[in-house]
């Protein structure tokens, strides 16, 4: 899988959209996890509603929100009030039983707000309008691994 790079401004919201084959992933919950190290485990941040038919409802964990449009095949994750510590490698996952299939790998980069060191005056950007999807620049590496499920003993 290629890694999608998304950039967001510190203090603003970053929206990530992961698309998938709606029929192939029918009935499956989705999750957003943060990868710990290059080959480390992916630590669950948030997952969609436990009842698949209600997956369109927003689920929140801290400043991260997830919602799934199961008919369109798009799971949307919003990272609110982006902080430098949010930078890193994440995964959109499709859950089935014990298995977690990677839908997309996402590298989140946090840009410092240039206004941080200046007097912002009366400038104020409402939360809703400060959400953007960032530049979806894909790494054209040859690391197109197959999604595999190692046997669990």
């Amino acid at each position: 899988l290629n890694t999608t790079v998304l950039q967001g401004m510190a203090g603003q919201s970053l929206r990530v959209s992961c698309t998938y084959d709606a029929l192939k992933h029918w009935g499956r919950r989705k999750a957003w996890c943060r990868q710990l190290g290059e080959e480390g485990p992916c630590q669950r941040v948030v997952s969609t509603h436990g009842v698949w038919l209600l997956a369109f409802l927003k689920k929140r964990n801290g400043s991260t929100v997830i919602a799934d449009d199961t008919l369109a095949g798009t799971v949307t994750i919003t990272l609110k009030n982006l902080q430098a510590g949010d930078a890193g490698l994440y995964q959109c996952q499709s859950l089935r039983g014990r298995e977690a299939e990677v839908l997309q790998k996402v590298l989140v980069e946090v840009l410092e707000d240039p206004l941080d060191d200046q007097d912002a005056g009366d400038l104020w950007v409402p939360e809703e309008s400060s959400s953007f999807e960032g530049a979806q620049v894909e790494h054209s590496t040859s690391r197109n691994q197959e999604t595999s499920f190692p046997p669990t003993s």
């Epitope: 192939k24 029918w26 009935g27 698949w52 039983g97 014990r98 298995e99 046997p151 669990t152």
Partner: antibody, heavy 122, light 108 residues
């Protein structure tokens, strides 16, 4: 009527290659996973692997990984199980089966082919 | 992999009696991913129960499934002559999917 129709019985010699088929009809073939199951004479069922014909995503049981190849041709709604070099121990009945699903869950293997008998003998 | 152990290996009963078949998993399995199949000689398996307790289309209500975690049960409330067959449990909670070894229900 939803059904899976498998190719006919095969008699082969050790070392020969073989490809058996499973043709789906009466439903959207590309949107359901198709699994393969082996049953050796007088024995139980063994899960070999599964394929999603829509994009040919495939999973194998470790016991069969490298021993067989599962593939599909969605244009003719057909899944395949193949061997490059048969062994006497491959003698068995092979079934294909559809993995069904419903809103928020899984229906098990709800539609089965009639089975293909493979006999490998010198 | 998850190993499913079925017991007893053979169950000898008379028509009209109650049959209780057990399937034990080596690791916990979500009940959503446990199924039961019936196989008669010379025939392909037939799905009876999915999600541990839901009857498949066309399956008579004398067949019922229950259980959770590692212990699952298939019950046939009153055996009919056509029920004498081999029964398999199967999990698709974790790859590789696996079947139990089967329980043969024979006429006493």
């Amino acid at each position: 009527e939803v059904q899976l129709v498998q190719s006919g019985a095969e008699v082969k010699k050790p070392g020969e290659s073989l490809k058996i088929s499973c043709k789906g009809s009466g439903y959207s073939f590309t949107t359901y996973w198709i699994g393969w199951v082996r049953q050796m004479p007088g024995k139980g069922l063994e899960w070999m692997g599964i394929i999603y014909p829509g994009d040919s995503d495939t999973r194998y049981s470790p016991s069969f990984q490298g021993q067989v190849t599962i593939s599909a041709d969605k244009s003719i709604s057909t899944a395949y199980l193949q061997w490059s070099s048969l062994k006497a121990s491959d003698t068995a009945m092979y079934y294909c089966a559809r993995a069904g699903h419903y809103d928020g869950g899984h229906l098990g293997m709800d539609v089965w082919g009639q089975g293909t008998t493979v006999t490998v003998s010198s | 992999e998850i190993v499913l152990t079925q017991s007893p290996g053979t169950l000898s009963l008379s028509p009209g009696e109650r049959a209780t078949l057990s399937c034990r998993a080596s690791q916990s399995v979500s009940s959503d991913y446990l199924a039961w199949y019936q196989q008669k000689p010379g025939q392909a398996p037939r799905l009876l129960i999915y999600g541990a307790s839901s009857r498949a289309t066309g399956i008579p209500d004398r067949f019922s499934g229950s259980g959770s975690g590692t212990d699952f049960t298939l019950t046939i409330s009153r055996l009919e002559p056509e029920d004498f067959a081999v029964y398999y449990c199967q999990q698709d909670y974790s790859y590789p999917w696996t079947f139990g070894g089967g329980t043969k229900v024979e006429i006493k």
